[in-house]
Interface confidence: low
Amino acid sequence: QAGPLPKPTLWAEPGSVISWGNSVTIWCQGTLEAREYRLDKEESPAPWDRQNPLEPKNKARFSIPSMTEDYAGRYRCYYRSPVGWSQPSDPLELVMTGAYSKPTLSALPSPLVTSGKSVTLLCQSRSPMDTFLLIKERAAHPLLHLRSEHGAQQHQAEFPMSPVTSVHGGTYRCFSSHGFSHYLLSHPSDPLELIVSGSLEGPRPSPTRSVSTAAGPEDQPLMPTGSVPHSGLRRHWE
């Protein structure tokens, strides 16, 4: 007897991090034998949506014309073939930015830092939030994720980097969020350019992936080193 049907592949275009109001397409790719595709959204009635396959039947398109809070969440897809339903795909986490006002990102003591020294990136929100994310442009997403302990809300989070190397140089943004839905993020902060001078190391590795793309298994987040910040936030490496 044949084993279970192979699980489909689920992804989003242009990526899994979408700003409010923008369109996004969710794709589910199964096999040529697929007769129907089904998309489930966590904590929503199931099936969340169903679509007939597009020729040559090995994938289906689920369109979201305008991103709102409704659509943020965790998805899985399935396909039905003549022998039954497939295993679920790996989950896709669709994140919406623009749910809250943008935080402010600054560098202490300065965004111009000498290699080997320390710098702390400070993300500050106007209203208290309990989750902060630091993103480095053209790096895996998210770069750093700080969540407050015991649900305590903070106006800021510290991201210390020590010792700084040339790898830390680049453009950063931060987001704030509430822990009860990490699928809803604030508008991004204005970009902060961290410039590392006096480096004796070789050139920085060339970037390979943009922030808006869902990180694949080959992506290795670039993680600043350093002690756990003392802002009441627990560090989560993801």
Epitope: W48, R50, S66, T68
Partner: antibody, heavy 121, light 107 residues
Framework: QVQLQESGPGLVKPSETLSLTCTVS????????WSWIRQPPGKGLEWIGY???????NYNPSLKSRLTISVDTSKNQFSLKLSSVTAADTAVYYC???????????????WGQGTTVTVSS | DIQMTQSPSSLSASVGDRVTITCRAS??????LAWYQQKPGKVPKLLIS???TLQSGVPSRFSGSGSGTDFTLTISSLQPEDVATYYC?????????FGQGTKLEIK
């Protein structure tokens, strides 16, 4: 079958805060928008604001400075607080759920019975 | 903010008449429009949403049309139980503004 029930005082004094709670029964509060709407005597419907189950909110600009909508997922409830009320806030207050089906969201398909709030000294 | 304007504000028609209520948005709202019926002393009921999709259990004499800025609710053959105030509402983005309502009476 999802049902909504508003609760709170029927009489509020001017300048005080109006507080109402909507209890969701027969279903989960998760993954829906939950709204408050009001209707002054003899007048039309006015959208007050919504809260998503995650806590994200959006308010009617004309009420924003006085309005707070919150959610308690553990109790399957969401609440409205309107501060500094005047006689103009006298109305029937409804809670409602924004509808959903197969990947699409639409108008408010489930409503509470409404609760009359009078602002008077 | 986008304004929603309904017309007429009231109308009187005979049983069996074809009745049309219009709703105009001050900006394009695609088809993110809902129509509600509120009978006297009752809770509003969702009839149509999005603009042309009849909700389950709503009689087929009701229909909706339009997209962008101009929308229409039509009752093909007016019945006595259709006496109510009808509201349109946009929901493409907040605020989810209602029209001012159209009061429908039987002649």
């Amino acid at each position: 079958q999802v049902q909504l029930q508003e609760s709170g005082p029927g009489l509020v004094k001017p300048s005080e805060t109006l507080s109402l709670t909507c209890t969701v029964s027969g279903g989960s509060i998760s993954s829906y928008y939950w709204s408050w709407i009001r209707q002054p005597p003899g007048k039309g419907l006015e959208w007050i604001g919504y809260i998503y189950y995650s806590g994200s909110t959006n308010y009617n600009p004309s009420l924003k400075s006085r309005l707070t909508i919150s959610v308690d997922t553990s109790k399957n409830q969401f609440s409205l607080k309107l501060s500094s009320v005047t006689a103009a806030d006298t109305a029937v207050y409804y809670c409602a759920r924004r509808g959903y089906s197969y990947g699409y969201y639409y108008g408010m398909d489930v409503w509470g019975q409404g609760t009359t709030v009078t602002v008077s000294s | 903010d986008i304004q929603m304007t309904q017309s007429p504000s009231s109308l009187s028609a005979s049983v069996g008449d074809r009745v049309t209520i219009t709703c105009r948005a001050s900006q394009d709202i695609s088809n993110y429009l809902a129509w509600y019926q509120q009978k006297p002393g009752k809770v509003p009921k969702l009839l149509i949403s999005p603009a042309s999709t009849l909700q389950s259990g709503v009689p087929s004499r009701f229909s909706g049309s339009g997209s962008g800025t101009d929308f229409t609710l039509t009752i093909s053959s007016l019945q006595p139980e259709d006496v109510a105030t009808y509201y349109c509402q946009k929901y493409n983005s907040a605020p989810w503004t209602f029209g001012q309502g159209t009061k429908l009476e039987i002649k």
